[in-house]
Interface confidence: low
C-alpha cells in the first residue's frame, strides 16, 4: 500500500487546515492507528494527536481543541485531521504516520502553508496644484503572507514604484503614484487594486483626486458695445472662471469706487439704468486657496443725444498672482 | 447577526470580587481575539484586556494587572473577566468586543455593556 | 506607553461644516489607528481602521488620514446624525490605548 497525501497544503489565516493522509492498500488491510505530528526544526517532533481505529481521537493537550477529525462520513482508513482556525505559527512541516496491519507503517511528511490576507490602507500624497512637477498623489500599503501584489488602475497619467519590507512572517508592500498635477484630473478616481493569493477577489480603495488650480479670469458683457447706452436697464457684466477649490469673486472699478447702485453679486456686477457715470475701467479679481487673477475692461457708456461721440473699442487685460 | 452580552455586574464593596460574563453569538467565536473595555460615567473609554483566539495569549492595562483575569471558554461562546480588589476607581461599565480579526486588536462589534459599581 | 491626545476635546459646527479632530500619539504607530463613534447612551462604532480605511457602511462624508503620530478625522459635512464622541485608539501594540475623545455638538 502507500499515503496519499499532499505536499502543500494551502489556507487561509482562521481557516481550518485539512491535513491529508489517506492509506490506499490491499481490500483485507486495516489501519490501526494514526499518529501525527510537528515538525519543528527548532523545537524537533511535537505530538499533535493520535487516531486509533478503536479509541479515537487522542489529542495532545498543546493542541487541544484544535484538531479534529473530518465530519461523517469517514473511510477507516482516511486518516486526515482539520486543524482549526489556521494562524501563522502553524505553517511549517507536518508528518503523518501510519501503522497498517498486515503492511507495518507508513509515513509521509506535507507542508503547511498560511496565508495571510492584506489588510490595505490608502494615504493620499500632500495636496496637489497645477503646476508642481511629478508630485506624490496616494500610497498604498498591504501586510500579507505571501507578500500581496499592489498596483493602481486608473485612466490619469502616472508613474508607481513600489517597495517592500519583509518580516519575519509577512511582507509589507508599498506601492506610490506620482503625477503631474493637471485640472483634467481633478475628480478622477485613483485606485489601489491589492491583489493576494488568500483573497477570493482584488481588494480595491478608491482615491478620488483633487487638483488645486485657477483659471484665468475674463469678462463677458461687452461683446456689443452698442448695448452699453444710457438708459439701458438690466447691464451686467459676468465674470468667467473656474477653479478648484471654487474660487470667490469681487468687483472694484480701477479709477475710483463703484458708481452707486451698481450691486456685485458673486461672479456678476449688475447696473442700474446706465448713465454716462458709469464709464470707466472695471477689475474682476477671482481667488483662490492657490492663487488669485484679474481681469480688467474698460465700459464706454454711449449717449445717443451725443451723436459725435465715436465708439470706443472695448480693451481688457487679464494679471494672476500666485498665494 | 453578531451578538455580544455582558452580564454581572452590579454594585460591590472594594476590596471584594466580581466575575463578568460575556455571550457572544452570530460568529466564529473560536477565530476571534476578544477584549473588555470599560467607560467610567461621563468619562472616556480604556481599554482593559485582550485574550487571543485560542486563550494562549493574554494582555492587560496596568491599571488592572495583577488584579483582573480574562479568559474565555471556546466550547460555551464565553469570554469572562475576573475581578479581584476591587477599587472605586474600576466602577464603570464595562463592555466586551470582539476583534476585527484574529489579533488586529480593533474592534468591529461591541457589547451593550454592564455596570460595575464599587461603593462602600 | 504610547500616549493619545485628541484635540479639541470639544466642538460645535454648523450643519454642513466640514469637521475637522486630530489624534497626536506621543511616539509613531505607523498607521494603526482606528476611529469610532458613540452616540449618546449608545455602544461605540467602528468608523475608520488603518487611518484611512472606512470600515463598511459608514458614510463616505467620514474620512482619515494620517501615518506615524498625527492623523485626522474628517467630517466633511456635518449632520445632524453625527452628534457624538469621537476617539482614537492604536492598536500596533498593547496596551491598545484611547484618546480622550473628543464631542461633537451641532450650534
Known amino acids: 500500500g502507500e499515503l496519499e497525501t499532499s505536499d502543500v497544503v494551502t489556507v487561509v489565516l482562521g481557516q481550518d487546515a485539512k491535513l491529508p493522509c489517506f492509506y490506499r492498500g490491499d481490500p483485507d488491510e486495516q489501519v490501526g492507528q494514526v499518529a501525527w505530528a510537528r515538525v519543528d526544526p527548532n523545537e524537533g517532533i511535537r505530538e499533535l494527536a493520535l487516531l486509533h481505529s478503536k479509541y479515537g481521537l487522542h489529542v495532545n493537550p498543546a493542541y487541544e481543541d484544535r484538531v479534529e477529525q473530518p465530519p461523517p462520513p469517514r473511510d477507516p482508513l482516511d486518516g486526515s485531521v482539520l486543524l482549526r482556525n489556521a494562524v501563522q505559527a502553524d505553517e511549517g512541516e507536518y508528518e503523518c504516520r501510519v501503522s497498517t496491519f498486515p503492511a507495518g507503517s507508513f509515513q509521509a511528511r506535507m507542508r503547511l502553508r498560511v496565508l495571510v490576507p492584506p489588510l490595505p490602507s490608502l494615504n493620499p500624497g500632500p495636496p496637489l496644484e497645477e503646476g508642481q512637477g511629478l508630485t506624490l498623489a496616494a500610497s498604498c500599503t498591504a501586510e500579507g503572507s505571501p507578500a500581496p501584489s499592489v498596483t493602481w488602475d486608473t485612466e490619469v497619467k502616472g508613474t508607481q514604484s513600489s517597495r517592500s519590507f519583509t518580516h519575519p512572517r509577512s511582507a509589507a508592500v508599498t506601492s506610490e503614484f506620482h503625477l503631474v498635477p493637471s485640472r483634467s484630473m481633478n475628480g478622477q478616481p485613483l485606485t489601489c487594486v491589492v491583489s493576494h493569493p488568500g483573497l477570493l477577489q482584488d481588494r480595491r480603495i478608491t482615491h478620488t483626486l483633487q487638483v488645486a488650480f485657477l483659471a484665468e479670469a475674463s469678462v463677458r458683457g461687452l461683446e456689443d458695445q452698442n448695448l452699453w447706452q444710457v438708459g439701458r436697464e438690466g447691464a451686467t457684466l459676468k465674470c468667467l472662471s473656474e477653479g478648484q477649490p471654487p474660487p470667490k469673486y469681487n468687483w472694484t472699478r480701477l479709477d475710483g469706487p463703484l458708481p452707486s447702485g451698481v450691486r456685485v453679486k458673486g461672479d456678476t456686477l449688475g447696473f442700474p439704468p446706465l448713465t454716462t457715470e458709469h464709464s470707466g475701467v472695471y477689475v474682476c479679481h477671482v481667488s483662490n486657496e492657490l492663487s488669485s487673477r484679474d481681469s480688467q475692461v474698460t465700459v464706454e457708456v454711449l449717449d445717443p443725444e451725443d451723436p459725435g461721440k465715436q465708439v470706443d473699442l472695448v480693451s481688457a487685460s487679464h494679471h494672476h498672482h500666485h498665494h | 447577526e453578531v451578538q455580544l452580552l455582558e452580564s454581572g455586574g452590579g454594585v460591590v464593596q472594594p476590596g471584594r470580587s466580581l466575575r463578568l460574563s460575556c455571550a457572544a453569538s452570530g460568529f466564529t467565536f473560536s477565530s476571534y481575539g476578544m477584549h473588555w473595555v470599560r467607560q467610567a460615567p461621563g468619562k472616556g473609554l480604556e481599554w482593559v484586556a485582550v485574550i487571543s483566539y485560542d486563550g494562549s495569549n493574554k494582555y492587560y492595562a496596568d491599571s488592572v494587572k495583577g488584579r483582573f483575569t480574562i479568559s474565555r471558554d471556546n466550547s460555551k461562546n464565553t469570554l469572562y473577566l475576573q475581578m479581584n480588589s476591587l477599587r472605586a476607581e474600576d466602577t464603570a461599565v464595562y463592555y466586551c468586543?470582539?476583534?476585527?480579526?484574529?489579533?488586529?486588536?480593533?474592534?468591529?462589534?461591541w457589547g451593550q455593556g454592564t455596570l460595575v459599581t464599587v461603593s462602600s | 506607553d504610547i500616549v493619545m491626545t485628541q484635540s479639541p476635546s470639544s466642538l460645535s459646527a454648523s450643519v454642513g461644516d466640514r469637521v475637522t479632530i486630530t489624534c497626536r500619539a506621543s511616539q509613531g504607530i505607523s498607521n494603526y489607528l482606528a476611529w469610532y463613534q458613540q452616540k449618546p447612551g449608545k455602544v461605540p462604532k467602528l468608523l475608520i481602521y488603518a487611518a484611512s480605511t472606512l470600515q463598511s457602511g459608514v458614510p463616505s462624508r467620514f474620512s482619515g488620514s494620517g501615518s506615524g503620530t498625527d492623523f485626522t478625522l474628517t467630517i466633511s459635512s456635518l449632520q445632524p446624525e453625527d452628534v457624538a464622541t469621537y476617539y482614537c485608539?492604536?492598536?500596533?501594540?498593547?496596551?491598545?490605548?484611547f484618546g480622550q475623545g473628543t464631542k461633537v455638538e451641532i450650534k
Open positions: 468586543a470582539k476583534d476585527y480579526g484574529y489579533n488586529w486588536n480593533f474592534f468591529d462589534y
Open positions: 485608539q492604536k492598536y500596533n501594540s498593547a496596551p491598545y490605548t
